[in-house]
Interface confidence: low
């Protein structure tokens, strides 16, 4: 444990003013594992002036950092980059003249306590005023800054010319794009101080590159993947005071694909489960032994789960008999193309025929497709047929 500090397995505290510490406490190799430290308390350390970029990075489990009544003047921008668990920071009564939001923007902080610091009234700390104004809790801090006359001024009264939140405006074409095509988004940002512009593309799969020049930026997305349909793309403007973003949703049109089609399973009803992808939403058509299957209340398509451009459902059959055994083909079609897949279904043997002679179809419950709640019922009511007994034209046995 560093001189002037005490350590336990989860805590480091340095409160003795003499001899004091001149650098952020670091644990000796082969001592306590720094990853297990959840709290660091530093007080009365007038010679601790700087938190360098790599001082805190080893304490990845750190939740509470308290440095009070000390000499902290500078904190490196990336000091807390690896401390994603930090929830409480208390820098009360230090020598901080400035502090950037960049120190903390990646953290999910519950508390950031900064009272008693000699902040300089400048645009650098305007973000703190904005933070105070947007905080819902009533216990807002009394933060002050020193103006040009070295007079203490409440941060709430701080007025700095040319120092405000930035703006971002996305000029996007119709962001409905065909798979494989390309699109370019343009964004302009504004504000004083002049913001930086960056793109937040999340987990975009498609190849993309951006160009930024001062207040203008463009993002070119090439060979657009259907996996990116529904994803949000944001243009972000960021300056000292804060950030603004403008977002668009990408819609990718693509030909249907039947990614899953299985033999029937029995639950409340018999179900031939399927998954179809496509955008716009594909029209579904079933064929039985090569002929169009007219749906009815006894045989109908049910979509149970829609996941953006993916549809999970069933061809639902009520009490099918051996007359319904046969080849079932699903065709999915939209304006960009079509796909079809076929399975052989065996519901029961013919009366008097030993079931054991028939193929063994597993009776697996396919819960995803047989939930009672239907999402997006695509039942075709136009060609109703009276019963499940569809004529077995080929007279084939299965």
């Amino acid at each position: 444990c560093p001189t002037s500090c005490k350590c336990s397995s989860a805590r480091i505290w340095c409160t003795e003013p003499s001899p004091g510490i001149v650098a952020f406490p670091r644990l000796e190799p082969n001592s306590v594992d720094p990853e297990n430290i959840t709290e660091i308390l530093i007080a009365n350390q007038k010679r601790l002036e700087i938190i360098n970029e790599d001082d805190v990075e080893a304490y990845v489990g750190l939740r509470n950092l308290t440095i009070v009544d000390s000499g902290l003047k500078f904190v490196a921008y990336k000091a807390f980059l690896k401390n994603s668990n930090l929830r409480h920071i208390n820098f009360t009564r230090n020598k901080l003249t400035s502090l950037s939001r960049r120190h903390f923007r990646h953290l999910d902080l519950s508390d950031l306590i900064l009272t008693g610091n000699p902040f300089t009234c400048s645009c650098d700390i305007m973000w703190l005023k904005t933070l105070q104004e947007t905080k819902s809790s009533p216990d807002t801090q009394d933060l002050y800054c020193l103006n040009e006359s070295s007079k203490n001024m409440p941060l709430a009264n701080l007025q700095i010319p040319n120092c405000g939140l930035p703006s971002a405006r996305l000029a996007a074409p119709n962001l409905t794009v065909e798979e494989g095509k390309s699109v370019t988004l343009s964004c302009s940002v504004g504000g004083d101080p002049l913001p930086t512009l960056y793109w937040d593309v999340g987990n975009l799969v498609s190849k993309h590159m951006n160009e930024t020049s001062h207040t203008q930026g463009s993002l070119r997305i090439t060979n657009i993947s259907s996996d990116d349909s529904g994803k949000q793309i944001s243009c972000v403007a960021e300056n000292l005071v804060g950030e603004d973003q403008d977002s668009v949703n990408l819609t990718v049109h693509f030909a249907p694909t039947i990614t899953f089609l299985e033999s029937p399973t029995s639950d409340h009803h018999w179900c031939i489960p399927f998954t179809v992808r496509g955008n716009p939403k594909p029209a579904l058509q079933w064929f039985y032994n090569g002929a169009i299957l007219n749906e009815s209340k006894y045989i109908c398509t049910k979509i149970h789960v829609t996941n953006h451009t993916e549809y999970h459902g069933c061809l639902q059959l009520d009490n099918p008999t051996h007359m319904n055994n046969g080849d079932y083909t699903l065709m999915a079609k939209n304006e960009y193309g079509k796909d079809e897949r076929q399975i052989s279904a065996h519901f029961m043997g013919r009366p008097g025929v030993d079931y054991e002679t028939n193929p063994n179809y597993p009776e697996v419950l396919y819960e995803d497709w047989t939930t009672p709640t239907d999402i997006g019922d695509t039942t075709n009511k136009s060609n109703e047929i009276p019963s499940t007994d569809v004529a077995d034209q080929s007279n084939r046995e299965h």
Epitope: G20, V22, A23, K46, R47, E49, I50, N52, E53, D54, G71, K73, F74, A76, Y77, K78, K95, T97, S98, P118, T120, L146, S150
Partner: antibody
Framework: QVQLVESGAEVKKPGESLKISCKGS????????IAWVRQMPGKGLEWMGI????????RYSPSFQGQVTISADKSISTAYLQWSSLKASDTAMYYC?????????WGQGTMVTVSS | QAGLTQPPSASGTPGQRVTISCSGS????????VSWYRQIPGTAPKFLLY???QRPSGVPARFSGSKSGTSASLAVDGLQSDDEADYYC???????????FGTGTKLTVL
Amino acid sequence: QVQLVESGAEVKKPGESLKISCKGSGYSFTTYWIAWVRQMPGKGLEWMGIIYPGDSDTRYSPSFQGQVTISADKSISTAYLQWSSLKASDTAMYYCARLGGGMDVWGQGTMVTVSS
Amino acid sequence: QAGLTQPPSASGTPGQRVTISCSGSSSNIGSNTVSWYRQIPGTAPKFLLYGNNQRPSGVPARFSGSKSGTSASLAVDGLQSDDEADYYCAAWDDSLSGYVFGTGTKLTVL
């Protein structure tokens, strides 16, 4: 070993521009502040400003704000002090120093002479 | 900018103890630590003491520092002829958000 090496002496005319350098080695250049200090002939030390090379955050002494520009290029571990228009009163020795608890490492100094 | 105040000169005979004072205000020495630097004319300053009284490695124990309120002092024990130099104190000034140096003291070994 830790050292700061400054560029050579300069003789300039009033109104000319100048950029002097300070190259750090033997330590993590991006994680220590660099200070610039002026010493006019026969006079004491004056603090001009500091820069954090990791992100080029810069602070100036009120006396030097607007008179000089401090910058850094972390890719080559070098800090700079520049003037856009020199005056005769800028004639001095200029030192760079690393901030590590105090100004613990100093450059050898760059003598700048401004004379018509 | 207002710096720290030091006596222009100090002197002593070899073997003597000499102290150099450094006076500031509540915004610098009063609330921050003091460092000391030594400069032989024609060369760069050298780091002598930091944190009011801490010696970097290589600095003889003859050099010591102290601080009280808004003043600090440097003491040189067992004065030697090669201690002749200019000595500067420095401290961070909160109101200036920057360092301030002392006016400098020329130490002469008689």
